[in-house]
Interface confidence: low
């Protein structure tokens, strides 16, 4: 709490300008009118205030707006936004996309902070839905935001927004989310040629069905093992040895190191040992020669 002290004679601020950087903290508190600050917030970012001085300016705004800042002030907070706590932000009602963009710009290049997460949450809830413009804005600043959404929320994501997604932004997505995102990515990238298409779709393949993996195996894509290990087990199981070899290309070598892990382990159990032997990797655990393979799921469906 800054002590209340009278403003020295001749120091009363007539406007927010460079001269204020020479004010001590107590002088800022005493000599800057909060209403003046609120109307001239757009000037604050052009002035190299210290963090301590910004603390004083925030305190003045908090006193003026104890129930939360109006959007006209929020939009021009600039670097002062970094001083806000999630509790401060929960009091706001942000409805303008321009306001959201302005504040995300301040945090650009940094990880999503609790403040930004709270801001986004307030904004989306205020809008009532995750519309295309909002999502385009959010994925432009935080493509990883997609993985924080539920599969239900993701279903409203337009395919055009998928273009903003980088591979690393899907690292935290679980299979249920990829199940929703993959068809959108497939649609978004459908007009690209083979190799370019694979580069773009690769990160989303954790949601791909068997038939799409079979199609990819015919295109010399050379999928790396890290991608293969993230594929849906149920999508991998029906692939033949020949299809997996074509899908992985030179990376088929890596199956040996992963033979005890899913989905490789489960896939091996479904293959004939004879077929596995043709890979020359020493993979063990396939169906011995002469054994009949019964598809029990088909049998159950018939009974």
């Amino acid at each position: 709490e800054v002590e209340k002290t009278a403003c020295p004679s001749g120091k009363k601020a007539r406007e927010i300008d460079e001269s204020l950087i020479f004010y001590k903290k107590w002088e800022l508190e005493a000599c800057v009118d909060a209403a003046l600050l609120a109307t001239q917030m757009d000037r604050v970012n052009a002035i190299p205030f210290t963090y301590e001085q910004l603390d004083v300016l925030k305190h003045k705004l908090d006193e003026l707006y104890p129930q939360g800042y109006p959007e006209s002030v929020i939009q021009h907070l600039g670097y002062l936004f970094l001083k806000m706590s999630p509790e401060d932000i929960r009091k706001w009602n942000v409805t303008s996309l321009e306001t959201l963009k302005a504040l995300l710009e301040v945090n650009k290049g940094h990880e999503m902070s609790p403040q930004v997460a709270t801001l986004i949450d307030r904004f989306v809830k205020g809008r009532g839905q995750l519309d295309k413009d909002t999502l385009d804005t959010l994925t432009a600043f935080y493509p990883g935001y997609l993985c924080s959404l539920s599969p239900e929320e993701l279903s409203s994501v337009p395919p055009s927004s998928i273009w903003a997604v980088r591979p690393q932004d899907l690292d935290t997505c679980d299979p249920r989310q990829l199940d929703v995102l993959y068809p959108k990515a497939r649609l978004a990238f459908q007009n690209m040629n083979g190799s370019e298409y694979f580069v773009k779709i690769q990160s989303f393949l954790g949601g791909a069905p068997t038939e799409d993996l079979k199609a990819l195996s015919q295109q010399n894509v050379s999928m790396d093992l890290a991608t293969f290990m993230k594929l849906r087990t149920d999508a991998v199981l029906p692939l033949t040895v020949a299809e997996v070899q074509k899908l992985l290309g030179p990376h088929v070598e890596g199956l040996k190191a992963e033979e005890r892990h899913r989905p490789v382990r489960d896939w091996i159990l479904r293959q004939r040992q004879d077929d596995l032997d043709t890979l020359g990797l020493g993979l063990q655990g396939g169906i011995p020669n002469g054994y009949l393979v019964l598809d029990l799921s088909m049998q159950e469906a018939l009974s």
């Epitope: 020949a242 290309g249 030179p250 990376h251 088929v252 070598e253 032997d277 043709t278 890979l279 020359g280």
Partner: nanobody, 115 residues
Framework: QVQLVESGGGLVQPGGSLRLSCAAS????????MRWYRQAPGKQREYIAG???????YYADSVKGRFTISRDNSKNTLYLQMNSLRAEDTAVYYC?????????WGQGTQVTVSS
Amino acid sequence: QVQLVESGGGLVQPGGSLRLSCAASTSIFSIGTMRWYRQAPGKQREYIAGMTSDGTTYYADSVKGRFTISRDNSKNTLYLQMNSLRAEDTAVYYCNTVAHFQNYWGQGTQVTVSS
């Protein structure tokens, strides 16, 4: 049909080095991956190292940092440089490749590490 012939094995003291070669009867340029395996008496054949046509290498944990696989496409030859050899490296070393879904093996070369 690919024929593989290994050479370079022999008796070596612990800590010593050997370089194995595997000569292929056909151009290995078009062959995807070439590998080295070994089999010690009474044990299963063990995968040691592999090298893809684009130069990516793979090693079993037991030899990582000690063995180096390489290939010379112009000589149609695969190599295995083995350093810091231990008694447990004693085995018959085999060269392997797969072409057109056929598995090809050499006849093997004996490596004995003993003092």
